[in-house]
């Protein structure tokens, strides 16, 4: 008897109710490997949810969450609060980074700007609440006159980012 | 801060009908992402889910009370409603109102709950 | 529909004891449950959600473990303010709750 259930596709249940025959999934459900005495409920996008991937007969719904929202958990099993970037999201919603930190994204914390003079450089651009500072030479590399293995870099014209 | 106050309890007679409130302060019904749902618990019972409205005015209903319940929302008093039909004994409870998900992060569990109201199904 | 069975339905605990609490799902449910502590003449109040996940305010004796059918809330060290009744409740598909499990002292 064994035998016959193990001949059960996925997308189907070994069905003890009419001598071990393999009937299809119930609508709404799915078994993904074969030899299934019972098909599984679809997950179901409900609320904060939206279905990504619909249910088959042999794989589970996918959901994804509505506009303004971002998934987290494992498979989407929750929704969090989108939030601008420079911003980050505390318990009473979104809150702008604080002066030093920066986020660069709609999700996650706002995290401090690199400081430069930590690896002997400085700051070239300055950093905002959406961007980080970007570190330049060290102040030595730039003075006149310093000695260096390598050549200095060329001097950027006003009005000209760094590439 | 997110509050939900429940009315419309009370006693009621075998076959007639009910409709429960819920005034919901500190959030809107119409929030995306955001359901509210009724719960509710029999004496010395446990607790049962009925039904749920989201953001989006979607239903979802217990399979096994669903020809009994309607479960609808005035966002314009921002509150929530549940009418329950053809009532008997065994539908005698303390009716809870509760909001879907916590504050930032949502999922289908319930974060904020009302203090329920007492229905009594009795002649 | 998904059924959820908690495991035991009550049991006498002294107040310092470990305490765990098993739930078991019909079916897998992932991740997609909750847990609440409900004290006589008030509402639930929620613990734990997406299985593990502490509810702010809630405090840190309190944990939730497990995936798929089995899950067990746990509390270290059990408090005189802990004597309650639990509940799990599944999400994955409409929402379920457990029968309940009582927390008595012994």
């Known amino acids: 008897l064994q035998d016959l259930c193990s001949n059960c596709p996925a997308g189907t249940f070994c069905d003890n109710n009419r001598s071990q025959i393999c009937s299809p999934c119930p609508p709404n459900s799915f078994s993904s490997a074969g030899g299934q005495r019972t098909c599984d409920i679809c997950r179901q996008c409900k609320g904060v949810f939206k279905t990504r991937k619909e249910c088959s007969s042999t794989s589970n719904a996918e959901c994804d969450c509505i506009s303004g929202y971002h998934c987290l958990g494992a498979e989407c099993s929750m929704c969090e609060q989108d939030c601008k970037q420079g911003q980050e999201l505390t318990k009473k919603g979104c809150k702008d980074c604080c002066f030093g930190t920066f986020n660069d994204q709609k999700r996650g914390i706002c995290r401090p700007w690199t400081n430069c003079s930590l690896d002997g450089k400085s700051v070239l651009v300055n950093g905002t609440k959406e961007r980080d500072v970007v570190c330049g030479p060290s102040p030595a590399d730039l003075s006149p006159g310093a000695s260096s293995a390598t050549p200095p870099a060329p001097a950027r014209e006003p009005g000209h980012s760094p590439q | 801060e997110v509050q939900l106050v429940e009315s419309g309890g009370g006693l009621v007679q075998p076959g007639g009908s009910l409709r429960l409130s819920c005034a919901a302060s500190g959030f809107s019904l119409s929030t995306g992402g955001v359901g509210v749902g009724w719960i509710r618990q029999a004496p010395g019972k446990g607790l049962e889910w009925l039904a749920l409205i989201d953001w989006a005015d979607d239903k979802y209903y217990s399979p096994s009370l669903k020809s009994r319940l309607t479960i609808s929302r005035d966002n314009s008093k921002n509150t929530l409603y549940l009418q329950l039909n053809s009532l008997r004994a065994e539908d005698t409870a303390v009716y809870y109102c509760a909001r879907g998900g916590s504050d930032t992060v949502i999922g289908d569990w319930f974060a904020y709950w009302g203090q329920g109201t007492l229905v009594t199904v009795s002649s | 529909d998904i059924q959820l069975t908690q495991s035991p339905s009550s049991l006498s605990a002294s107040v310092g004891d470990r305490v765990t609490i098993t739930c078991r799902a019909s079916?897998?449910?992932?991740?997609?449950l909750a847990w609440y502590q409900q004290k006589p003449g008030k509402a639930p109040k929620l613990l734990i959600y997406d299985a593990s996940n502490l509810e702010t305010g809630v405090p840190s004796r309190f944990s939730g473990s497990g995936s798929g059918t089995d899950f067990t809330l746990t509390i270290s060290s059990l408090q005189p303010e802990d004597f309650a009744t639990y509940y799990c409740?599944?999400?994955?598909?409409?929402?379920?709750f457990g029968q309940g499990t009582k927390v008595e002292i012994k």
């Open positions: 079916q897998s449910i992932g991740s997609y």
């Open positions: 409740q599944q999400g994955y598909y409409l929402w379920t």
